[in-house]
């Protein structure tokens, strides 16, 4: 004969465990139903009556099957330097991440607690390491033959243009100014092949290669963090 299906609440077999989405109530000494995400236990079970669940109150949530007496409070509204990437609902907490141009200086289990503005490299300096979701920009001085004339958190040092005739030599914060009508842009060491000789400049050395990838904004996209575990939840 097939085993009878037990309806909650029921006493488990000696040494046995409760089924999925049930929990063992110590007071009633019975297997009782858990409440689904978005709800909490309004009335705990007894020997003769099952758990009574109720919807989470405004601005609270439960993410897992549970038997908590109160839902968890959602986090505060996102601050002005943040964007809400996940709204507070009955089943999930609010997640705030840093808006473009900012990074997370102090993270929390989900999202970010404190955002800080990405460092801007001043003229003469370029981005050595782009900012990420959780780290600031690192700047470096532009090497000989390269320049940056912007204050930017994304611009790298770029090679000076190579002139047929130089009007004003370039430096770390300014590109070279040519007198000829068709300057050539140096892209990388040994990569420039000109059909005629160019004027030499004592300060012009081979430009250092630029980082292989220019930083974009993709690093600001939120990475889904793992959800928090509630005190007395889990299947």
């Amino acid at each position: 004969l097939p085993a009878q299906v037990a309806f909650t609440p029921y006493a488990p077999e000696p040494g046995g465990t409760c089924r999925l989405r049930e929990y063992y109530d110590q007071t009633a000494q019975m297997c009782c139903s858990k409440c689904p995400p978005g709800q909490h236990a309004k009335v705990f079970c007894t020997k003769t009556s099952d758990t009574v669940c109720d919807s989470c109150e405004d601005s609270t949530y439960t993410q897992l099957w549970n038997w908590v007496p109160e839902c968890l409070s959602c986090g505060s509204r996102c601050s002005s330097d943040q964007v809400e990437t996940q709204a507070c609902t009955r089943e999930q907490n609010r997640i705030c991440t840093c808006r473009p141009g900012w990074y997370c200086a102090l993270s929390k289990q989900e999202g970010c607690r404190l955002c800080a503005q990405l460092r801007k490299c001043r003229p003469g300096f370029g981005v050595a390491r782009p900012g990420t979701e959780t780290s600031d920009v690192v700047c470096k001085p532009c090497a000989p033959g390269t320049f940056s004339n912007t204050t930017s958190s994304t611009d790298i040092c770029r090679p000076h243009q190579i002139c047929h005739v130089v009007a004003i030599p370039g430096n770390a914060s300014m590109d070279a100014v040519c007198t000829s009508t068709s300057p050539t842009r140096s892209m990388a060491p040994g990569a420039v092949h000109l059909p005629q000789p160019v004027s030499t400049r004592s300060q012009h050395t081979q430009p250092t290669p630029a980082p292989s990838t220019a930083p974009g904004t993709s690093f600001l996209l939120p990475v889904g963090p793992s959800p928090p575990a509630e005190g007395s939840t889990g299947d």
């Epitope: 919807s55 405004d58 601005s59 505060s76 509204r77 609902t89 609010r94």
Partner: antibody, heavy 120, light 108 residues
Framework: QVQLVQSGSELKKPGASVKVSCKAS????????MHWVRQAPGQGLEWMGR????????KHDPKFQDKAVLSSDTSVSTAYLQISSLKAEDTAVYYC?????????????WGQGTLVTVSS | DIQMTQSPSSLSASVGDRVTITCTAS???????LHWYQQKPGSSPKLWIY???NLPSGVPSRFSGSGSGTDFTLTISSLQPEDFATYYC?????????FGQGTKVEIK
């Protein structure tokens, strides 16, 4: 844009009942609560109750538990407040206001108000 | 019930004055659940400060809010003609949700 449009003024006799409507537009009715707040002439704001239009669940100030019935019809995006056994002291402007779920009860949009006058 | 008591009930001030309104709760209120509304005669209330210190878009930056526990304040750093109105605090911490009795800001 978000709008809450309430029904017009009402003049009622003592003992009668009145039903005030609040039609919502410009937002999803699913993740909000609709509150009812009253203001007697020259007085302050008094929270009466709220309804979750998605589930029909209501919560009242106990003072209004037997006086006010909250309901909603999601098919027409309208919330209703019915007040029974009207007395002269129920003369007031009745406002509907919404609060989005997760905004800690901040009522960010209000109806224009409905004046209910109870007089014999 | 949590009683919300505002002080003063009314005040007269001049344009340019700094104005502070206080709201005292009879028991502790989480700062997320404390809001302020502005109401002008013949108009519906408007959400003016939410969660103790946050300004909705359109509210001038001369308004600020602060506080925790049982004591909360709304401050106008430099009163302007359009600020003359009644201000209400509101707690959503525990049902029934309650408003303060209001503070009327009048022209001196």
């Amino acid at each position: 844009q978000v709008q809450l449009v309430q029904s017009g003024s009402e003049l009622k006799k003592p003992g009668a009942s009145v039903k005030v409507s609040c039609k919502a537009s410009g937002f999803n009715n699913k993740d909000i609560y609709m509150h009812w707040v009253r203001q007697a002439p020259g007085q302050g704001l008094e929270w009466m109750g709220r309804i979750d239009p998605a589930t029909g669940n209501t919560k009242h100030d106990p003072k209004f538990q037997d006086k006010a019935v909250l309901s909603s019809d999601t098919s027409v995006s309208t919330a209703y407040l019915q007040i029974s056994s009207l007395k002269a002291e129920d003369t007031a402007v009745y406002y509907c206001a919404r609060s989005p779920y997760g905004d800690f009860g901040a009522m960010d949009y209000w109806g224009q108000g409905t004046l209910v006058t109870v007089s014999s | 019930d949590i009683q919300m008591t505002q002080s003063p009930s009314s005040l007269s001030a001049s344009v340019g004055d700094r104005v502070t309104i206080t709201c005292t709760a009879s028991s502790s209120v989480s700062s997320n659940y404390l809001h302020w509304y502005q109401q002008k005669p013949g108009s519906s209330p408007k959400l003016w400060i939410y969660s103790t210190s946050n300004l909705p878009s359109g509210v001038p930056s001369r308004f600020s809010g602060s506080g925790s526990g049982t004591d909360f304040t709304l401050t106008i750093s430099s009163l302007q003609p359009e600020d003359f109105a009644t201000y209400y605090c509101h707690q959503y911490h525990r049902s029934p949700w309650t408003f303060g009795q209001g503070t009327k800001v009048e022209i001196k």
